[in-house]
């Protein structure tokens, strides 16, 4: 049930990590003019990775893309490349972890099958919030860097006569989404991980045997304690194939139309 | 089309006080700023502040903070200036501005004439 | 705040000609965001509120005649009225719409020679 748990909650954590991830790659306010110690403006300014952002005193908004691929400085490329990566990993993780959750049966897939599936997806998930976290990082240290050099030259002009006012910039809500949009990722893949250990089955596999008696059949099985005897619904003589103990939850019904996802 | 119609002149003692009135139309009023402006006789343009109809957010130029105050009723399309403790320097011409795209004062009021005389 | 400072403070020119007025700004205008100057030019005939011409320092607002044009860059701009007509005669001000307060230059008035 714990396994259940922690592999459903690492799904649904990381299904939020991986929204705000394309979330905060998606938004405009990666960096956003600083107000602070400034001549107050009737034009704020913000950016985005791709496009900047203008907005009036008006209420007008004016955006424009960022047309270049070349012009751009190669640490906005790979910041891009960072967080589209994240995106790409975070997502195939998502479509494999579907399929690895022990709610949703998908024909008779082994637990191993399963445990493997959720192991993967919470690797992806894993560098998927990894590589959110370095690309708003080594963004956010763009900006640092930035920042320092406009504020060492805030005022430039021609014998201090006249004064042009270089905008700065500083860290828009882009950067905290992504942040934590990248540590939710993260985790989620480290609950996985663990919910994989759960899920792998016992090392040893024994073969189980079944003894046929002429009254009701009885399956002896090496692993357990517990003798299941054919009274029930199903008078059919059964063959266990899986060693080990199973808890209750985890005792294999026939499939069902419900069973196929 | 877009018009911003003032209220008539005004002739106040000092210390009194005056509200002059600017109705909006031909737009939504919420979605664009009213900026008020002074010209005193024979000067030039003086930029007072604006109010944000959309917030009723104010800005005020430095010289007219205090007994200067920009409102709005929304429900009528009208911005209102109300100047309050009148000084003979008040006496100026009052416009009321429309703030569009480009941060540009594209529709003006035709002005109201506040006299301060005692 | 913003000293917009205009010149000249009056302008003669004879009708068909070319009238200048040029704008100068304490501070750049020039937003980086955009690469658009915040600065507005209006025209103010006696007796009547100003009108907008031009705005985004070379941006001719609708219906305003060719004639008129700006021109001009973070600190220094310039209105031309290339072929100046009778109902031209008016003070010019210019208005920098990018630091609060806003603020105009003194005017510039042009008369016919």
């Known amino acids: 049930m714990a396994v259940t748990a922690c592999q459903g909650l690492g799904f649904v954590v990381s299904l939020i990590g991986i929204a705000g991830i394309i979330a905060a790659t998606c938004m405009d306010q990666w960096s956003t003019q600083d107000l602070y110690n400034n001549p107050v403006t009737a034009v704020f300014n913000y950016q985005g990775l791709w496009r900047s952002c203008v907005r009036e005193s008006s209420g007008f908004t004016e955006c424009r893309g960022y047309f270049t691929l070349l012009g751009l400085p190669a640490m906005l490329q790979a910041v891009r490349a960072l967080m589209i990566v994240g995106i790409v990993l975070g997502a195939i993780g998502l479509l494999v972890s579907i399929f690895a959750l022990k709610c949703i049966r998908i024909g008779s897939m082994e637990d191993s099958a399963k445990a493997n599936m959720t192991l993967t997806s919470g690797i992806m998930f894993i560098v998927s919030g990894l590589c959110a976290i370095a690309g708003v990082s080594v963004f956010a240290n763009m900006l640092v860097t930035n920042f320092w050099m406009s504020t060492a030259n805030m005022y430039t002009g021609m014998g201090g006569m006249v004064q042009t006012v270089q905008t700065r910039y500083t860290f828009g809500a882009a950067l905290f989404v992504g942040w934590v949009a990248g540590g939710l990722t993260l985790i989620g893949g480290v609950m996985m991980c663990i919910a994989c250990r759960g899920l792998a089955p016992e090392e040893t596999n024994y073969k189980a045997v079944s003894y046929h008696a002429s009254g009701h059949s009885v399956a002896y099985k090496p692993g357990g304690f517990k003798a299941s005897t054919g009274f029930g619904s199903n008078t059919k003589n059964k063959k266990i194939y899986d060693g080990g103990a199973r808890t209750e939850d985890e005792v294999q019904s026939y499939p069902s139309k419900h069973d196929y996802v | 089309q877009v018009q911003l119609v003032q209220s008539g002149s005004e002739l106040k003692k000092p210390g009194a006080s005056v509200k002059v009135s600017c109705k909006a139309s031909g737009y939504t009023f919420t979605n664009y700023g009213i900026n008020w402006v002074r010209q005193a006789p024979g000067q030039g343009l003086e930029w007072m502040g604006w109010?944000?109809?959309?917030?009723?957010?104010?800005t005020y130029a430095e010289e007219f903070k205090g007994r200067f105050v920009f409102s709005l009723d929304t429900s009528v399309s009208t911005a209102y200036l109300q100047i309050s403790s009148l000084k003979a320097e008040d006496t100026a011409v009052y416009f009321c501005a429309r703030l569009y795209y480009g941060n540009r004062f594209d529709s003006w009021g035709q002005g109201t004439l506040v006299t301060v005389s005692s | 705040d913003i000293v917009m400072t205009q010149s000249p403070d009056s302008l003669a020119v004879s009708l068909g000609e070319r009238a200048t007025i040029n704008c100068k700004s304490s501070?750049?205008?020039?937003?980086?965001?955009?690469?658009?100057?915040?600065l507005a030019w209006y025209q103010q005939k006696p007796g009547q509120p100003p009108k907008l011409l031009i705005y985004?320092?070379?941006t001719r607002e609708s219906g305003v005649p060719d004639r008129f044009s700006g021109s001009g860059s973070g600190t220094d701009f310039t209105l031309t009225i290339s072929s100046l007509q009778a109902e031209d005669v008016a003070v010019y001000y210019c208005q920098q719409a990018y630091y609060y307060p806003l603020t105009f230059g003194g005017g510039t008035k042009v008369e016919i020679k």
């Open positions: 985004w320092a070379s």
């Open positions: 109010i944000n109809p959309n917030t009723g957010e104010t």
């Open positions: 501070q750049s205008l020039l937003n980086s965001g955009n690469q658009r100057n915040y």
